[in-house]
C-alpha cells in the first residue's frame, strides 16, 4: 500500500524559518503534490504550494520556495513573518496524486519539544482518505 511521509523541521540558524519535507512511498508516477497547513487539502486546510513534474511549482506566502528533492519527494521552505498562524503549532499536510494509485495524503507537525535543527520522525500518518 502506498504511503506518504511528512517531516517538519525548524532551521537551526533562523528560528522563524521552517522546512516541510514530504515523500511518497509506492509505485507509480507522481502527477501533482499539494502542500497545505491547518488541515488537509479541501478539508479546511490552506493551500501553501502545488508542484507538478512538468508545469512547475507555485507557492503562497508564508511559503517561500517549493522544490522537488527527488521524483517522489518535495520540500517547502516557509518564513514566519507574522502570518496568521505560528508554524510551531501548525499541522502541515501533503497530498500526492499518483497514477494509477490515486491520491494519498498525510499530515505532520513540529514536535512540541523540538530543538532547532531537529525534525519530526518520517513516520507516515495516513489521514482521512485515499481518493
Amino acid at each position: 500500500t502506498p504511503e506518504v511521509w511528512v517531516q517538519v523541521q525548524m532551521e537551526a540558524t533562523e528560528l522563524s524559518s521552517f522546512t516541510v519535507h514530504c515523500g511518497f512511498l509506492g509505485p507509480g508516477s507522481i502527477s501533482l503534490v499539494t502542500v497545505s497547513w491547518g488541515g488537509p487539502d479541501g478539508a479546511g486546510g490552506t493551500k501553501l504550494a502545488v508542484l507538478h513534474p512538468e508545469l512547475g511549482t507555485r507557492q503562497w506566502a508564508p511559503a517561500r520556495q517549493a522544490r522537488w528533492e527527488t521524483q517522489s519527494s518535495i520540500s517547502l521552505a516557509l518564513e514566519d513573518s507574522g502570518a496568521s498562524s505560528p508554524f510551531a503549532n501548525t499541522t502541515f499536510c501533503c497530498k500526492f496524486a499518483s497514477f494509477p494509485e490515486g491520491s494519498w495524503e498525510s499530515c505532520g507537525s513540529l514536535p512540541p519539544s523540538s530543538d532547532p535543527g531537529l525534525s519530526a520522525p518520517p513516520t507516515p500518518v495516513p489521514i482521512l482518505r485515499a481518493d
Epitope: 491547518g38 488541515g39 487539502d41 479541501g42 479546511g44 486546510g45 490552506t46 493551500k47 502545488v50 507538478h52 508545469l55 512547475g56 511549482t57 507555485r58 503562497w60 506566502a61 517561500r64 496568521s84
Partner: antibody
Framework: QVQLQQSGPELVKPGASVKISCRSS????????INWVKQRPGQGLEWIGW????????YYNEKFKGKATLTVDKSSTTAYMLLSSLTSEDSAVYFC????????????WGQGTTLTVSS | DIQMTQSPSSLSASLGGKVTITCKAS??????IAWYQQKPGKGPRLLIH???TLQPGIPSRFSGSGSGRNSSFSISNLEPEDIATYYC????????FGGGTKLEIK
C-alpha cells in the same frame, strides 16, 4: 465556464464603509485563492490582498492593512471586501481575480466595481 | 517588497510591426512574471505566465522571455485589437504590478 461577477457601482460619503461582492461560478470555489486589486482612474494596478476560501486565510498588502477586510461566504461562493473609513483616495475601480495556481496568477477577473467617495 | 519597473510607459507602432516591453524587478523573481492586457473599461486579461507560458487561446504573436530580474514581452505582427495597456506582474513574493505600458498604433 469560470466567471466572477462583481456588485454594482457605489457612491458613498467620506468616513463611511462599503462592502463589495464577487460571486464565483464554474469552478470549485474553495480550491483557489481570490485576490483583490485596486485601480485608480487613469492609473495602474495595485494588489490589495488575498483570501483562501477553503480556510478563510487572508494575507494583505501592508498598505491596505486596516483599510480592507476580506471575507467569503462558502454557501453562496461569494467573496467580499469591506473598505472602511473611506476618503477620496479610495475612489477607484476594484477588481476581484482568481489565482489559477499552476494555470497562472489572476487567470480570471471580475468586471470591476467602481467606488466613488464624495460628499 | 519587490518593486517592478516597466518601460516604456507608452509607445506607438505600425500595424504589422513588432513591439517589446520590459520589466525589471528589484530582486530575482525566479521567472515568476506574468503579462496582462487591459482595454478601457474592462478587467485585465492574462496573456502569459511563468515568463513565457502562453495562456490557452492567446495567439502566438505574443511572447515572453527573461531570467533573474529582467523580463521582456513582445507582440509581433501588430493588429488593431492589440491597442491596450499592458502590465507585468511579479508573483514570486506576494504580488507587484509594473506601472503599465500604453500601446498605440501609428
Amino acid at each position: 465556464q469560470v466567471q466572477l461577477q462583481q456588485s454594482g457601482p457605489e457612491l458613498v460619503k467620506p468616513g463611511a464603509s462599503v462592502k463589495i461582492s464577487c460571486r464565483s461560478s464554474g469552478y470549485t470555489f474553495t480550491d483557489y485563492y481570490i485576490n483583490w486589486v485596486k485601480q485608480r482612474p487613469g492609473q495602474g494596478l495595485e494588489w490589495i490582498g488575498w483570501i483562501f476560501p477553503g480556510s478563510d486565510y487572508t494575507y494583505y498588502n501592508e498598505k491596505f492593512k486596516g483599510k480592507a477586510t476580506l471575507t467569503v461566504d462558502k454557501s453562496s461562493t461569494t467573496a467580499y471586501m469591506l473598505l472602511s473609513s473611506l476618503t477620496s483616495e479610495d475612489s477607484a475601480v476594484y477588481f476581484c481575480a482568481r489565482d489559477g495556481g499552476l494555470r497562472g496568477p489572476f487567470d480570471y477577473w471580475g468586471q470591476g466595481t467602481t467606488l466613488t467617495v464624495s460628499s | 517588497d519587490i518593486q517592478m519597473t516597466q518601460s516604456p510607459s507608452s509607445l506607438s507602432a505600425s500595424l504589422g510591426g513588432k513591439v517589446t516591453i520590459t520589466c525589471k524587478a528589484s530582486q530575482d523573481i525566479n521567472k515568476y512574471i506574468a503579462w496582462y492586457q487591459q482595454k478601457p473599461g474592462k478587467g485585465p486579461r492574462l496573456l502569459i505566465h511563468y515568463t513565457s507560458t502562453l495562456q490557452p487561446g492567446i495567439p502566438s504573436r505574443f511572447s515572453g522571455s527573461g531570467s533573474g530580474r529582467n523580463s521582456s514581452f513582445s507582440i509581433s505582427n501588430l493588429e488593431p485589437e492589440d491597442i491596450a495597456t499592458y502590465y507585468c506582474l511579479q508573483y514570486d513574493n506576494l504580488h507587484t504590478f509594473g506601472g503599465g505600458t500604453k500601446l498605440e498604433i501609428k
